[in-house]
């Protein structure tokens, strides 16, 4: 496989990882599928200082990160553990709101204007942040 | 100049098997997604699939999930379309066509002449 | 999947004419909207992509806006050269989709 040594154009180097924030909305599963068709993930929030990072760059407006529990337990998109990683959960969420009327809970994890996180609907057509390691080997699958 | 020229079209049985393939040239091949458009008279224009530009995302339409694979050689310029299984409703031209990522989506630009698959007993 | 319509399916114009072509998506989106135009025996081309911005290369005659689930393509004065079929694609969300076209021949 290739690795990626640089950033792409109009991303933004920070701490070994590219980030690409957008400025306009799509569902969760439509944002995550922009991102892994560019070879990267909706972002991972691993540290504090990584929140405040991402936080500076999206502004007070909600925004998708790669955080869902739409299959039961909370998940992050790229494997990292959700049980013993960082998290900045508003007070009292996440809720599973069912009270919205759109059908279902809220299965998918966003910034909210104040940086914290919230569950929502995934359909909600909400920015987002894709993220991709530096130095990490492709998966570029053997051709048969 | 961006130039992509597929091959490998022609008349297959149905439940028969066929490989086509993309020469890209002009561009950094691996920073770019690409993908398959079908055409038929019928149907019009179909999406079909879409690979990362590391080939490790792929993505299907349901029509073609679990009988097409979407692939590439980077080291050689090479998008490929392998098809198996094939049915008469996938008599189409093919186009392969590079996806460019501006504006939180993906734009198809520039195509490729297009080659002809035809399913047929 | 997200449907996409055209109207008209056709429409017969003369050189120097305004044209206005309306696509509409079956769920509303953003401006996440492409138009192709396509000569007989071609491929597509890319006119316009995120709904209103001009691809590089394509004449200023050429106009897209909308948001949501109404779109437009507007040739502003028809040439020669742009007697073709045109087409949306929805690129919101997999399967991204098209419209089944619209036919501009000469009046």
């Known amino acids: 496989g290739s690795e990626r040594t640089c950033c792409p154009v109009n991303w933004v180097e920070h701490e070994r990882s590219c980030y690409w924030f957008s400025r306009s909305g799509k569902a969760w599963a439509d944002a995550d599928n922009y991102c892994r068709l560019e070879d990267a993930h909706l972002v991972v929030v691993t540290s504090w200082e990584e929140q405040k990072f991402v936080q500076h760059h999206i502004g007070p407006v909600n925004t998708w990160m790669g955080l869902h529990d739409q299959n039961g337990p909370w998940k992050w998109v790229d494997g990292t553990d959700y049980e013993t990683g960082f998290k900045n959960w508003r007070p009292e969420q996440p809720d599973d709101w069912y009270g919205h009327g759109l059908g279902g809970g809220e299965d998918c994890a966003h910034f909210t204007d104040d940086g914290r996180w919230n569950d929502d609907v995934c359909q909600r057509p909400y920015r987002w942040v894709c993220e991709t390691e530096l130095d990490k080997a492709s998966q570029e699958p053997p051709l048969l | 100049e961006v130039q992509l020229l597929e091959s490998g079209g022609g008349l297959v049985q149905p439940g028969g098997s066929l490989r086509l393939s993309c020469a890209a040239s002009?561009?950094?091949?691996?920073?770019?997604?690409m993908t398959w458009v079908r055409q038929t008279p019928g149907k019009g224009l179909e999406w079909v699939s879409a690979i990362s530009g590391s080939g490790g995302n792929s993505f299907y339409a349901d029509s073609v999930k679990g009988r097409f694979t979407i692939s590439r050689d980077n080291s050689e310029n090479t998008l490929y379309l392998q098809m198996n299984s094939l049915r008469a409703e996938d008599t189409a031209v093919y186009y392969c066509?590079?996806?460019?990522?501006?504006?939180?989506?993906?734009?198809?630009?520039?195509w490729g002449q297009g080659t002809l698959v035809t399913v047929s007993s | 999947d997200i449907q996409m319509t055209q109207s008209p399916s056709s429409v017969s114009a003369s050189v120097g004419d305004r044209v206005t072509i309306t696509c509409r998506a079956s769920q509303g989106f953003s401006t996440w909207l492409a138009w192709f135009q396509q000569k007989p025996g071609k491929a597509p081309k890319l006119l316009i992509y995120a709904a209103s911005s001009l691809q590089d290369g394509v004449p200023s005659r050429f106009s897209g806006s909308g948001s949501g689930t109404d779109f437009t393509l507007t040739i502003s004065s028809l040439q020669p050269e742009d007697f073709a079929t045109y087409y949306c694609q929805q690129t919101n969300s997999f399967p991204f989709t098209f419209g089944p076209g619209t036919k501009v021949d000469i009046k």
């Open positions: 002009g561009f950094t091949f691996s920073s770019y997604a």
């Open positions: 066509a590079k996806a460019r990522a501006v504006a939180g989506s993906h734009w198809f630009d520039p």
